[in-house]
């Protein structure tokens, strides 16, 4: 997260750590007791290591009651997630059990009704990704509120020229983002889950190069079809 | 497929009013910016500005802030361009051009005559 | 305005030739995203103009492998490899990266 700042811990009890080898990934948000929402383009990254993910986190290195590792038993990326586009990012991780549920670990309601987030409202997101241009990654949850952006802006040459569909929701950039490791992660605007943080290899900090992020509601149907 | 139709060609007396229409398919309207470039009889192309279709909210170049209007109708997926006041010199053909990926969609054009 | 100047304005070749364009802009087209929105379109007589390469070198989707654009800062070249009679029109240099956007007056490429 560019331009942020620390989060209260575990005041985001959703909040996941998608981790490969031990090492902090991408983010993710609990969606269900056994599900874990992230981005597709994460499995890319994670090449043949061990997939894991950490719930009740606020620090990746300190130990905490809260924090539990849990192991993958099923990834689900989305069917038409394809390497060279941004198109249809998410991954569904079945946890190997049902996450031990508390004030620190609580899966978070995402939107189901398929409408957009009106511009100009602000929206949370979170994450453990970098802090600085230089690549800094820090040890405790960062968060940063940002404002939607409408899509016919978010799509003019300058900015994403044209590569943002309706499936797709975009949040202004200019020096707060989102950025890499962030990927997966939540944004949430009044309480509910609304979008994810795609993963591609975009320019953060850039006003001119807003965040993108996948609607949720967008693939309400796929996401039940998998939790079933 | 994406298209955009334009309304078809106008004569118009100095001091009149016209308002040509861009109607658009093929994709959801309010997700792309809507451009109107001028052509002058025998001329080069000319950036007049855009509208957003999703704000509604327009912009202008310098040369056509005053007399020129855009609009929309974001039900019908139609943009619109207005002007008032008619001088000789905006005897042109006026082209509505789709955002993204660069100006990759154009209207066919709309030839506008001004004539005493 | 970032003025946008071609040359020549009018090309006359024959078929099977090879053509080269050349736009010069009057301010560095760079944006500060890194990327330089320079662009080109074709405009066959009666239609509107069609885009043909974007961001200084990419075809655009549909566009034959003839077509080639190159150049930085200020100084930009299309090449058509082997002109074919489809190819006849004007070719306008197209500057994204500064408000106002703008155009090049235009090359016409003619047979001889």
């Known amino acids: 997260i560019l331009g942020g700042r620390e989060a209260e811990a575990h005041a985001r009890p959703y909040m996941a750590s998608v981790q490969v080898n031990g090492e902090h990934l991408c983010g993710g948000v609990l969606v269900a007791e056994q599900w874990v929402l992230s981005a597709a383009h994460c499995l890319e990254d994670a090449a043949d290591g061990k997939v894991q993910v950490l719930l009740g986190a606020h620090s990746l290195s300190q130990p905490e009651p809260s924090k539990r590792l849990y192991d993958v038993l099923r990834a689900v990326p989305h069917p038409d997630s394809r390497p060279d586009t941004i198109d249809h990012d998410l991954l569904l991780l079945q946890l190997s059990e049902k996450a031990t549920l508390g004030p620190a670990v609580r899966p978070l309601p995402w939107q189901r009704v398929d409408r957009d987030v009106e511009p100009g409202t602000l929206c949370d997101v979170a994450g453990w990704g970098i802090v600085s241009h230089a690549g800094r990654r820090p040890d405790r949850l960062q968060h940063v509120l940002l404002p939607v952006l409408d899509r016919a802006t978010c799509n003019r040459r300058t900015h994403h020229d044209g590569a943002i569909t309706q499936r797709m929701m975009c949040a202004e950039s200019n020096r707060r983002d989102s950025c890499k490791g962030d990927s997966g992660g939540p944004l949430v605007c009044g309480g509910v889950l609304e979008g994810v943080v795609t993963s591609g290899s975009r320019v953060c900090g850039n006003r001119k190069k807003p965040g993108i992020y996948t609607r949720v509601a967008s693939y309400a149907a796929w996401i039940d079809s998998v939790l079933a | 497929q994406i298209q955009l139709v334009q309304s078809g060609p106008e004569l118009k007396k100095p001091g009149e009013t016209v308002k040509i229409s861009c109607k658009a398919s093929?994709?959801?309207?309010?997700?792309?910016?809507m451009n109107w470039v001028k052509q002058g009889p025998g001329k080069g192309l000319k950036w007049m500005g855009w509208?957003?279709?999703?704000?509604?909210?327009?912009t202008y170049a310098d040369d056509f802030k005053g007399r020129f209007a855009f609009s929309l109708e974001t039900s019908a997926s139609t943009a619109y361009l207005q002007i008032s006041n008619l001088k000789n010199e905006d005897t042109a053909t006026y082209f509505c051009?789709?955002?993204?990926?660069?100006?990759?969609?154009w209207g066919q054009g709309t030839l506008v005559t001004v004539s005493a | 305005d970032v003025l946008m100047t071609q040359t020549p304005l009018s090309l006359p070749v024959s078929l099977g030739d090879q053509a080269s364009i050349s736009c010069r802009s009057s301010l560095i087209i760079e944006h500060s995203d890194g990327n330089t929105y320079l662009e080109w379109y074709l405009q066959k007589p009666g239609q509107s103009p069609k885009l043909l390469i974007y961001?200084?070198?990419n075809r655009f989707s549909g566009v034959p492998d003839r077509f080639s654009g190159s150049g930085s800062g200020t100084d930009f070249t299309l090449k058509i490899s082997r002109v074919e009679a489809d190819d006849l029109g004007v070719y306008y240099c197209f500057q994204g990266s500064h408000v106002p956007v703008t155009f090049g007056a235009g090359t016409n490429l003619e047979l001889k």
């Open positions: 093929g994709y959801i309207f309010r997700n792309y910016g």
């Open positions: 051009v789709r955002d993204g990926p660069g100006f990759a969609y």
């Open positions: 509208i957003n279709t999703y704000t509604g909210e327009p």
């Open positions: 961001k200084v070198s």
